[in-house]
Amino acid sequence: VLPAKPENISCIFYYEENFTCTWSPEKEASYTWYKVKRTYSYGYKSDICSTDNSTRGNHASCSFLPPTITNPDNYTIQVEAQNADGIMKSDITYWNLDAIMKIEPPEIFSVKSVLGIKRMLQIKWIRPVLAPHSSTLKYTLRFRTINSAYWMEVNFTKEDIDRDETYNLTELQAFTEYVMTLRCAPAESMFWSGWSQEKVGTTEEEAPYGLDLWRVLKPAMVDGRRPVQLMWKKATGAPVLEKALGYNIWYFPENNTNLTETVNTTNQTHELYLGGKTYWVYVVSYNSLGESPVATLRIPALNEKTFQCIEAMQACLTQDQLVVEWQSSAPEVDTWMVEWFPDVDSEPSSFSWESVSQARNWTIQKDELKPLWCYNISVYPVLRDRVGQPYSTQAYVQEGIPSAGPVTQADSIGVKTVTITWKEIPKSKRNGFIKNYTIFYQAEDGKEFSKTVNSNILQYRLESLTRRTSYSLQVMASTNAGGTNGTKINFKTLSISVLE
């Protein structure tokens, strides 16, 4: 049987190194050897691939080496497959070396900001030594912020002026570390070089970008003053490296600026004590280069009716995220503030908040929340400077079985009845939403019975017991992950009732 006709011939010119062609089939059933015929010097000359017998057999690749690699040039390549039964020739393929030239990657030697030019990095690199001197090279510059996995790209071309080349990358974020890598190719080539080694550079620092500002309104104190916990953080989109030296706060009752109070702090939270009127609060951050834009917050009067527009809310888990969605009756509201914090018996130690715009859902990665912890999530509608009534829900990113079962006691023991009472498991030990409770009880040497009740029931009356009999009993609390038994208690039914 003749060998298969060589097909899918693909050639690449590694500049000043070799001209390599590959083809299929890569393996033949019987021993096959290949001859690659090339014409070069624009069809004036020809030769055959200089592979020796030891590598030629069943090897669907062949390289032509200098000095017969001419450039620029057009080559033809034809592959002949031969076995004991005969020869099969491929079609003749035509190759323009400029179109298939692959060169070394460039070498970036500096990525620096230019003094006084904001949001720009100047990349300097050395053009590859092994690249045609006269040709225009096309480049792809890839860049990303140091903590991002997402690359951005910019394409440009450079004439051969000098071996040292520069490119100014603009419209970057201020005071941000960027990773750069560069590749190149002759302008006409379909093959890019590999990527250069990555180089890091940082854009110049600027005045702070801005602040996101929020508050927690606490109940009024006996003297009528209202504690308001202010909190702020770098605005979304602010440079990662940005550091503020401090924060200026000023606030005053609405329409009464002459009662302005000012505070300076280096913390990102501050408690104010306000009267019952409406107040306006302003916060700026500053560094050695200036101040951020002002963040503004309106604190409503104590007696102000707040609007309500969230009708329903759902929290659901995807593979790696917690997604909270809500429905609103107010289409004009397009900004929402989401608060979340662990639901613990004591004052929550960590309180988080985030603004959502042009969406009615909020997503957080599961690994940002602790498993087995219950989180309170509240969403506030924000319409211009007014904050509406929140809608709240609770969620676990991962449920487990409770760390402890319910503490149980037997009350009102009768001849054939008993009332069982149990305490709620402390929040810190629930590890999930308690779905139900199951009471397991068993007479001495008798069969075990069980009764399951809803999670809102903390007391149950067992009936049809046997007179003057010892029973053991325990209550199991269950989450979606499973159940945990409480301590086992024993009781004995009476032999005679009071009525008897």
């Epitope: 004036y44 030769d47 055959i48």
Partner: antibody, heavy 117, light 113 residues
Framework: EVQLVESGGGLVKPGRSMKLSCAAS????????MAWVRQAPTKGLEWVAS????????YYRDSVKGRFTISRDNAKRTLYLQMDSLRSEDTATYYC??????????WGQGVMVTVSS | QFTLTQPKSVSGSLRSTITIPCERS????????VSWYQQHLGRPPINVIY?????PSEVSDRFSGSIDSSSNSASLTITDLQMDDEADYFC???????????FGGGTKLTVLG
């Protein structure tokens, strides 16, 4: 249409010089290797010389090396053959040819060169 | 350096088939492509076969080229001979030793009426 027109032939004495020209039209002259091929009366074809696209590389048969010079002017789309120290065995019809892929795809009509005393 | 050897003459009757061989003296016939030219008396040559077996579009499909490794030769075959096929035929290949083309001595084809 591709056209190659030779000129400059004639009768010349042995030891003297002669320059042949070949005017090309109908194709991008600078993209092709070009050649001179001769044919002595009642004899076969014999390659004389070839030149690369830009003129940087030239190739000659042994019997004319050092006596003949092939050149080209891409701006004028013209191929030349400068023949010095001519011998009687150089008597032939000289054809200008365009190189295709290892063959001559177009030929001129030929010009006669007679070397005789 | 190799030579290409052709028979001085070949003849065939009208509408018959003839084959002109072209034998390479040294090296493998398959190492470089072979071309064939037809030359009528007093006219320049014209190419009839290139790269072993390819035919220019304007050439009749009665002309075909082939390579035979066992005899280390190329062949030009003309079928259905016509009177106009009477001409000289030359084979040609590339010799890397001289860095140039090599022609065979030529074969005179006579078509018998």
């Amino acid at each position: 249409e591709v056209q190659l027109v030779e000129s400059g032939g004639g009768l010349v004495k042995p030891g003297r010089s002669m320059k042949l020209s070949c005017a090309a039209s109908g194709f991008t002259f600078s993209n092709y290797y070009m050649a001179w091929v001769r044919q002595a009366p009642t004899k076969g074809l014999e390659w004389v010389a070839s030149i690369s696209t830009g003129g940087g590389n030239t190739y000659y048969r042994d019997s004319v090396k050092g006596r003949f010079t092939i050149s080209r002017d891409n701006a004028k789309r013209t191929l030349y053959l400068q023949m010095d120290s001519l011998r009687s065995e150089d008597t032939a019809t000289y054809y200008c040819g365009r190189h295709g892929t290892l063959y001559f795809d177009y030929w001129g009509q030929g010009v006669m060169v007679t070397v005789s005393s | 350096q190799f030579t290409l050897t052709q028979p001085k003459s070949v003849s065939g009757s009208l509408r018959s088939t003839i084959t002109i061989p072209c034998e390479r003296s040294s090296g493998d016939i398959g190492d470089s492509y072979v071309s064939w030219y037809q030359q009528h008396l007093g006219r320049p040559p014209i190419n009839v076969i290139y790269v072993d077996d390819q035919r220019p579009s304007e050439v009749s499909d009665r002309f075909s080229g082939s390579i035979d490794s066992s005899s280390n030769s190329a062949s030009l075959t003309i079928t259905d001979l016509q009177m106009d096929d009477e001409a000289d035929y030359f084979c040609q290949s590339y010799d890397s030793n001289i860095d140039g083309p090599v022609f065979g001595g030529g074969t005179k084809l006579t078509v018998l009426g």
